[in-house]
Amino acid sequence: GITIPRNPGCPNSEDKNFPRTVMVNLNIHNRNTNTNPKRSSDYYNRSTSPWNLHRNEDPERYPSVIWEAKCRHLGCINADGNVDYHMNSVPIQQEILVLRREPPHCPNSFRLEKILVSVGCTCVTPIVHHVA
Amino acid sequence: GITIPRNPGCPNSEDKNFPRTVMVNLNIHNRNTNTNPKRSSDYYNRSTSPWNLHRNEDPERYPSVIWEAKCRHLGCINADGNVDYHMNSVPIQQEILVLRREPPHCPNSFRLEKILVSVGCTCVTPIVHHVA
């Protein structure tokens, strides 16, 4: 890994190694020009493997609202608007970091948590197994 | 919004409202059975809008490594294995939260940051603008 010289202006901490408990400023710095790409993009409707977005809300988590994609079809949409079952609509999943209130209901104490979310769907050629 | 009763066992904090600076335990709780869905899935290759995964590393960020998808083609792969340019391969993007060391190089002080990542690609019907 890359060793970074420690900034002398850092807040004090008991453990100088990579910390287990850290201070985090929740004033989010947004590096994106577009605040919500899902809302501004209509790919979910125009895709050959279209999807619906389902709201997942959990007040004990930050962010409390996460949108989950569910593929609309088993197969993929062809040029005629019919479903091709020789292709499969599958969710593209990603692990993301969220903050989970710990202990529960605490406003200023969290634990990092990894969750798997479906972001959208893509159309794939199936793996066909011929059974003898 | 949902009001949650405050847990009396919470750590002390100066601000009892939703905090600006919080304590975060970095011992990640992983809710996923599969630790890396991208590695175990070959959708990036089997998709009609295949993509490559590019490693984005930043030691000042947590997680320091993020994988970015880049669509391989402008169009989509048809049944013959050729690129159809009457369809478009487009990236599915998602805003994710990361921790940015602040001040820089500090091991135990971070700021939440939103970044936009491309998770995979999907095949969409293009929006055709007819010019008069």
Epitope: L74, Y85, H130 | -
Partner: antibody, heavy 115, light 107 residues
Framework: EVQLVESGGGLVQPGGSLRLSCAAS????????ISWVRQAPGKGLEWVSS???????TYYADSVKGRFTISADTSKNTALQMNSLRAEDTAVYYC?????????KTQPAMDVWGQ | DIQMTQSPSSLSASVGDRVTITCRAS??????LAWYQQKPGKAPKLLIY???SRASGVPSRFSGSGSGTDFTLTISSLQPEDFATYYC?????????FGQGTKVEIK
């Protein structure tokens, strides 16, 4: 055990309505469509309608479009609401599970049928 | 829509005979073809999926072959319980379509 149980058939006048139900158990809706297939007396099989409840999509044969409505609830019950019925809709109606036949992504088929 | 045409529409055979039923699709459907058996008053039963893969519990005397537009269901040695109507069905794209059926009768 994977099972489909139909109910709700009956005698109805032309122009009338009827609701068929299909109770599913023993499998996940996320991998399958539930289809309705009918068979007129002495005739062959005809696909009528399908629903992919997980994705919220419904499909209809041209012969029933606008008259029949397929729906599913969270309890894995699928219903076929048949309105403006015609003499040619007289048939035995079966519900069937349609999807990837095994745990592999194989070619799909209607592998489980109602009674 | 993809049209499925079966032949013959009926056939008479004896126990022990080798029986062949053919199914033709109006366009290529790769190997996305299923065969079903239906007995009077009963629901259809899946025999073959993916043109050549036997469904669980189906006797080995039933076999399927073909790809593209032409497919065959073969019963190597006809048994008394095999007298029924057989249907092919394409699962390549919607709408799902069946052949008109082949009735296998006792000679």
């Amino acid at each position: 055990e994977v099972q489909l149980v139909e109910s709700g058939g009956g005698l109805v006048q032309p122009g009338g309505s009827l609701r068929l139900s299909c109770a599913a158990s023993g499998f996940s809706f996320s991998s399958y469509e539930i289809s309705w297939v009918r068979q007129a007396p002495g005739k062959g099989l005809e696909w009528v309608s399908s629903i992919y409840a997980y994705g919220g999509s419904t499909y209809y044969a041209d012969s029933v479009k606008g008259r029949f409505t397929i729906s599913a609830d969270t309890s894995k019950n699928t219903a076929l609401q048949m309105n403006s019925l015609r003499a040619e809709d007289t048939a035995v109606y079966y519900c069937a599970r349609f999807g990837m036949y095994s745990r592999w992504k194989t070619q799909p088929a209607m592998d489980v049928w109602g009674q | 829509d993809i049209q499925m045409t079966q032949s013959p529409s009926s056939l008479s055979a004896s126990v022990g005979d080798r029986v062949t039923i053919t199914c033709r699709a109006s366009q290529s459907i790769s190997s996305y073809l299923a065969w079903y058996q239906q007995k009077p008053g009963k629901a259809p039963k899946l025999l073959i999926y993916g043109a050549s893969s036997r469904a669980s519990g189906v006797p080995s005397r039933f076999s399927g072959s073909g790809s593209g537009t032409d497919f065959t269901l073969t019963i190597s040695s006809l048994q008394p319980e095999d007298f029924a109507t057989y249907y092919c069905q394409q699962s390549y794209s919607s709408p799902l379509t069946f052949g008109q059926g082949t009735k296998v009768e006792i000679k």
